[in-house]
């Protein structure tokens, strides 16, 4: 396997933020966009946003959907635009399924 | 119950190489980082770096980069160090640690793997 | 790379006291610290993660506060398993640093 070298400055990306932790912003910068989709007393809480931190997006990003919750992540300016995450539905696995895209 | 049990402690010969295992049980790495840590005697911790076990990416601090090599196997679920043309300086205990959510820092760590360079 | 300065090298108390140390950042990281309890012979331990936050099973008198280039931890009502050293580190930015710790002596 290849060692990737350390990276000065690592390529920063543009995302849409979408939810509260985006305050007034409607845009973020960071390493990776994500969308998410999870329940919370029994609401649909989306969210867009960015990791600003790489290690928190690839810990992030390798979490598998469960019922409650589902992250799907990008690298690639705008890239989340148009990602809408979605649950697993009723009766499906998703083994080794890989909630990533490039851009 | 989260464990990471390390290999013996190492006594090596100045310019050789040795390589030091971290043996998870509790849970599986490749739901996690696997990072590696120096710490030499009466000072201070260095993070090594971390492997992604699930894909093989590894991701160094730049003083370690041509020293240490991460590596895993995630059928044993086993992460290795690595340390390549050992000095003095090599000589510390280095301590593997898991990296998960939701804290994002190390949560779990090793016992730590002595190792003592001398001729 | 992220400097960490951690203040004191080191400090004496008493059981009962309350002590706070602190760490600066070389450059703003949020509140992507942790900090670390390490007794001698013994491998690190997470107390705080996040800067403010409550690793499991960590007792309430351990605290953290701060965001940006400062922050401090407190441990309040100091007890006689609690004399070890200290370290802060930062997880916002590789290589991940640490501050150069602090030994909690008994006075």
């Known amino acids: 396997m290849e060692d990737e070298k350390p990276k000065v400055n690592p390529k920063l990306y543009m995302c849409v933020c979408e939810g509260l932790s985006c305050g007034n912003e409607d845009h973020c910068e960071g390493q990776q966009c994500f969308s998410s989709l999870s329940i919370n007393d029994g609401f649909h809480v989306y969210q867009k946003g960015c990791f600003q931190v790489y290690e928190q997006g690839k810990m992030t990003c390798k979490t598998p959907p469960s019922p409650g919750q589902a992250v799907e992540c990008c690298q690639g300016d705008w890239c989340n635009r148009n990602i809408t995450a979605q649950l697993p539905t009723k009766g499906k696995s998703f083994p080794g399924t890989q909630n990533f895209h490039l851009e | 119950e989260v464990q990471l049990q390390q290999s013996g402690a190492e006594l090596v010969r100045p310019g050789a190489s040795v390589r030091l295992s971290c043996t998870a049980s509790?849970?599986?790495?490749?739901?996690?980082?696997m990072h590696w840590v120096k710490q030499r005697p009466e000072q201070g911790l260095e993070w090594i770096g971390w492997?992604?076990?699930?894909?093989?990416?590894?991701k160094y601090a730049p003083n370690f980069q041509s020293k240490a090599t991460i590596t895993a196997v995630t059928s044993s679920n086993t992460a290795y160090l690595q340390l390549s043309s050992l000095t003095s300086e090599d000589s510390a205990i280095y301590y593997c640690?898991?990296?998960?959510?939701?804290?994002?820092?190390?949560?779990?760590w090793g016992q730590g793997t002595s190792v003592t360079v001398s001729s | 790379d992220i400097q960490m300065t951690q203040s004191p090298a080191s400090q004496s108390a008493s059981l009962g006291e309350s002590v706070t140390f602190t760490c600066l950042a070389s450059?703003?990281?949020?509140?992507?610290l942790a900090w670390y309890q390490q007794k001698p012979g013994k491998s690190p331990q997470l107390l705080i993660y996040?800067?403010?936050s409550l690793a499991d099973g960590v007792p309430s008198r351990f605290s953290g506060s701060g965001s940006g280039t400062k922050f401090s931890f407190k441990i309040s009502s100091l007890q006689a398993e609690d004399f070890a050293s200290y370290y802060c580190?930062?997880?916002?930015?590789?290589?991940?640093?640490f501050g150069g710790g602090t030994k909690l002596e008994i006075k």
């Open positions: 640690a898991r990296y998960t959510s939701p804290y994002y820092t190390m949560d779990y």
């Open positions: 509790g849970f599986n790495i490749k739901d996690s980082l």
């Open positions: 492997i992604d076990p699930e894909d093989g990416e590894t």
């Open positions: 450059q703003t990281i949020g509140t992507w």
């Open positions: 996040a800067a403010t």
């Open positions: 580190q930062q997880v916002y930015s590789t290589p991940w640093t």
